[in-house]
């Protein structure tokens, strides 16, 4: 699995999407787990409704919510009020019995709010991260860039 990078702004919401083959994963509940390091174990954060037919209902654990479009084959995770400690490795998983298949590996990056002048010295334009030469970046910054503002480049 390649890692997909989702970048969000501190204090805002970040939506992570995990597409999957709806036929292959028919009848399976899904989960969102946090990985402790690149090779570490994955700790469950939140999972979809116990009844698969009700997977479209939003389930929440703290500031993290999950919902599953089982027909369209898209699992959506929303992280509200994004904080620095939310950054890290996650996985979208498809559950079957005690096993879990990885649908997508995700790296969540939390960007300093460019409009938060209290922390102007911390404005982050990420540098090259050699961890993810093949990582795909999904920009999920939820507002338009200001005129003349440099967009955050991917961490490769």
């Amino acid at each position: 699995h390649n890692t997909t990078v989702f970048q969000g702004v501190e204090g805002q919401s970040l939506q992570v999407s995990c597409p999957y083959d709806s036929m292959k994963h028919w009848g399976r509940r899904k989960a969102w787990c946090r990985q402790l390091g690149e090779k570490g174990p994955c700790q469950r954060v939140v999972s979809t409704h116990n009844l698969w037919l009700l997977s479209f209902l939003r389930r929440r654990n703290g500031s993290t919510a999950i919902t599953d479009d089982t027909l369209g084959g898209t699992l959506t995770i929303t992280l509200r009020n994004l904080q620095p400690h939310d950054a890290g490795f996650y996985q979208c998983q498809s559950l079957h019995g005690s096993e879990a298949d990885t649908l997508r590996k995700v790296l969540v990056e939390v960007l300093a709010d460019p409009l938060d002048h209290r922390d102007a010295g911390d404005l982050w334009v990420p540098g090259e991260s050699e961890s993810f030469e093949d990582a795909h970046v999904e920009h999920s910054i939820s507002r338009s860039l200001l005129e003349g503002e440099i967009p955050f480049p991917p961490t490769s």
């Epitope: 690149e38 090779k39 570490g40 950054a87 890290g88 490795f89 939390v110 982050w124 990420p126 961490t155």
Partner: antibody, heavy 120, light 107 residues
Amino acid sequence: EVQLQQSGAELVRSGASVKLSCTASGFSIEDFYIHWVKQRPEQGLEWIGWIDPENGDSKYAPKFQGKATMTADTSSNTAYLHLSSLTSEDTAVYYCHADHGNYGSTMDYWGQGTSVTVSS
Amino acid sequence: DIQMNQSPSSLSASLGDTVTITCHASQHINVWLSWYQQKPGDHPKLLIYKASNLHTGVPSRFSGSGSGTGFTLTISSLQPEDIATYYCQQGQTYPRTFGGGTKLEIK
């Protein structure tokens, strides 16, 4: 018991090379990244690089490229650090260190260190 | 490479004191910072990971805070066994880099 056991102290001539070993017990090195860290006498810590024993992938700090070569043998659960063209600057204690990589690893194991002394 | 500036380089404090060590990163590193303690003749030991998480078995008098570029290690009620050198290390990008260390001594 989980531990990393490093090879014994080395006294080597300038210009020679040396190979240090780090053997894991209580866990499989394939499940971890093995890092090597250098500490010169009365100095701070310098990260040399890591190797992923599962596939042999490695990353080096630019300063140590060409100087250090990391390898791993999963059958003996051992990681190696080869240092070439030794000079007095290479006199240091070298530590091996296992963790789950960047982004929040909660695992952290260290070897006791191997002292390398380069004599002219 | 990301530079880690640690201060002070040495520190003298009395038993029972609260001690603060700071680490400043040359680039934003989010919360990817660890603190290590090293006693003479011993290997470094992880105290804090991910800026503020206490590693297993580490006494609760140790605490970490910060994100972005500024980080702090605090030792409340200094104990004799806390005499050591403390290092910060960034884990945002490779190469990983350490701060220069803070040598803590008893006054």
